[in-house]
Structure formats: C-alpha cells, structure tokens
C-alpha cells in the first residue's frame, strides 16, 4: 500500500514528586517501520531510560506504537520526541500543563 504518515501525540502525566512521565504515541501509519525516541537537547536518550511499546496493527491496515520516559518537572523544554518514518522526520515538544499536541507529520 501507499505510505501513510503517522499521527504523533505527546502527553504528560504526574509521576513522582518533581517528576513527570512524557509519552509519545504514533498512530495510523504505514508501513510499520518507524523510529520513535525521546531526545534531550537534541540528543537521543539512552535506551535504558526509555520504555517502548510494540508496533501493533490498529485495525485499519495501519500501525501504532509509543515511547515514554520520565523527566524532571521544569525541564520540559529540553525534551522532544523524534519520529522517523519512510524517509521523513519530525520533532514534537512536551506540552505545557496537562494539554497534549497531536498532528500528522508533514516534512
């Protein structure tokens, strides 16, 4: 089938005192090969500090996955979710407060 770019959605939730968990979800993409990673200052975080979900079919002939990490509250501006899919890439910031951002990638 033809390439379908992912919808990328970044959310945050309270973790422990002074920390938040940030989650980057990519959905509705095809083909299934994708790179999703959290970055600090533009540098990919170490493997051990991130948790990845499996790349799974979402029932529409496309796929979904996620990556999460825990960061210090107040340092959100240093962190971005980086996505690569079918030769295209994009970066997605941590939203302020409890809001979330989501959009299709166009690059």
């Amino acid at each position: 089938g033809s390439t379908v770019p992912p919808m990328v959605n970044v959310t945050r939730s309270e973790a422990s005192e002074g920390n938040i968990t940030v989650t980057c979800r990519a959905s509705s993409f095809y083909p299934r090969n994708i790179i999703l990673t959290w970055r600090q200052d533009g540098v990919s975080l170490s493997h051990d500090t991130q948790q990845w979900g499996d790349v799974l079919p979402d029932g529409n002939g496309t796929y979904q996955t996620w990556v999460a990490t825990r960061i210090c509250r107040g340092e959100e501006q240093r962190f971005t979710c980086y996505m690569e899919h079918s030769g295209n890439h994009s970066t997605h910031p941590v939203p302020s407060g409890n809001s979330h951002h989501h959009h299709h990638h166009h690059h």
């Epitope: 970055r39 540098v43 990919s44 170490s46 493997h47 051990d48 340092e75």
Partner: antibody, heavy 116, light 107 residues
C-alpha cells in the same frame, strides 16, 4: 553546516583556556547539542561537554568542576572555558554538533599547548 | 564510564581488500554505537550511526553491525582515500566515550 574553532595556541599552567566555535549553515538555537571534544597526543578522544539549543549545558563529570560552555546566539557562536589548566590539558580541541545519536559535523580542530 | 576497546590498533591492507575493525564495550550499549573517520590532516567525519545506519554522503562500501557489547565496521573494498584512523563511540550511557582508534594504511 560548518564549524570552526579558534583560540590561543599556547596557555600557561594555572590559567584559563578559552576557545570559540563559529557555526555557519545552521542556527545553534534551532536544535541539537553543540559539543566540545578534545584529542590528546596519542589520539585518545575525550568528550568535554555541550550546550543544547535551549542553552542548557551538560558536562563530563571528570571535568565539571573546571569547565564552562556558553554561547552568543547573535553571532551563532559557542565557547569553551577550561580553568586551572595543566600540561595534561594539552590537546587538539574540536567542536561538533550532536544530532540525535551521533556527532554529524565536526570542526577541523585547534591545537592548544599548556606550557610555561 | 563505559570503556570502549578497539582492535586492531593499526592494520595494513591492499587496495580492494575487505577490512573489518572491531569495537567492544565493557557493558551493553544497546546499539548506540557510532563510527568516525579521521583523515591524516585531522578532519573528522561521521560514517555510521546507531550501529548500522550510513550517514548521508558516505560511500556504500562502509557498513556497520553488532549488538550488545560487540560491534564492527567493515570497508568492503578498500580505496586509497580510506587511509585514516577510525574511532568508535558509545552514546548510550553518559558520558559518551570513544575507542582508542584504528589506523588503516595501504600495503
């Protein structure tokens, strides 16, 4: 993207070493981390630290007490200051951009000798 | 700090030869392994990032592989312009650290 290091080639022991990295072709406030690395005689490479596009800094713990990396966004430059130098700080100093997993662009390096 | 051991420290090969350089970490670095080329004039270029991804503009005769603690760089068809010193770098666990280098010469 091009990076170019500059600074004095000779520094006296106990003084401070100050170097400049001039970046062209990409804004240092756009993205990525802007690094200093040094190469000792004999080829050993050591990462010194970086200043990120937001202005946040991260240093090698082995040098943290002596190092400061700053920037001038109006000139698209970033700087290294290494205090209380000794002859063991004699090296070629490189600046480089760290993009995602790797340092994809490097300067040509500038040689610094610490000697009285 | 993670220690990176590169072997051999130097090698001499004929034009057209297949050359392999090894890099071993003293703990798992989860594919966060890069290879750089340093020409005799000191200029440093990225060749391979994240174990096996070829940086833009790098000839296809360069390839990388490995996992866990053991990684390698292969030059499939040695050319005169490949005379240089090659370094590996781990980026998984701060601070990032480099191998000691492998000097490649032509017989």
């Amino acid at each position: 993207v091009q990076l170019q290091e500059s600074g004095p080639g000779l520094v006296k022991p106990s003084q401070s070493l100050s170097l400049t990295c001039n970046v062209t072709g990409y804004s240092i406030t756009g993205d990525y981390a802007w690094n200093w690395i040094r190469q000792f005689p004999g080829n050993k490479l050591e990462w010194i630290g970086y200043i990120g596009y937001t202005g946040s800094t991260t240093y090698n713990p082995s040098l943290k007490s002596r190092v400061s990396i700053t920037r001038d966004t109006s000139k698209n430059q970033f700087f290294l200051q290494l205090n209380s130098v000794t002859p063991e700080d004699t090296a070629t100093y490189y600046c480089a951009r760290w993009r995602n997993w790797a340092m994809d662009y490097w300067g040509l390096g500038t040689s610094v000798t610490v000697s009285s | 700090d993670i220690q990176m051991t590169q072997t051999p420290s130097s090698l001499s090969a004929s034009l057209g030869d297949r050359v392999t350089i090894s890099c071993r970490a003293n703990q798992d670095i989860s594919h966060y392994l890069n290879w750089y080329q340093q020409k005799p004039d000191g200029a440093v270029k990225l060749l391979i990032y994240y174990t096996s991804r070829i940086h833009s503009g790098v000839p296809s005769r360069f390839s990388g592989s490995g996992s866990g603690t053991d990684y390698s760089l292969t030059i499939a068809n040695l050319e005169q312009e490949d005379v240089a010193t090659y370094f590996c770098q781990q980026g998984n666990t701060p601070p990032t650290t480099f191998g000691g280098g492998t000097k490649v010469e032509i017989k």
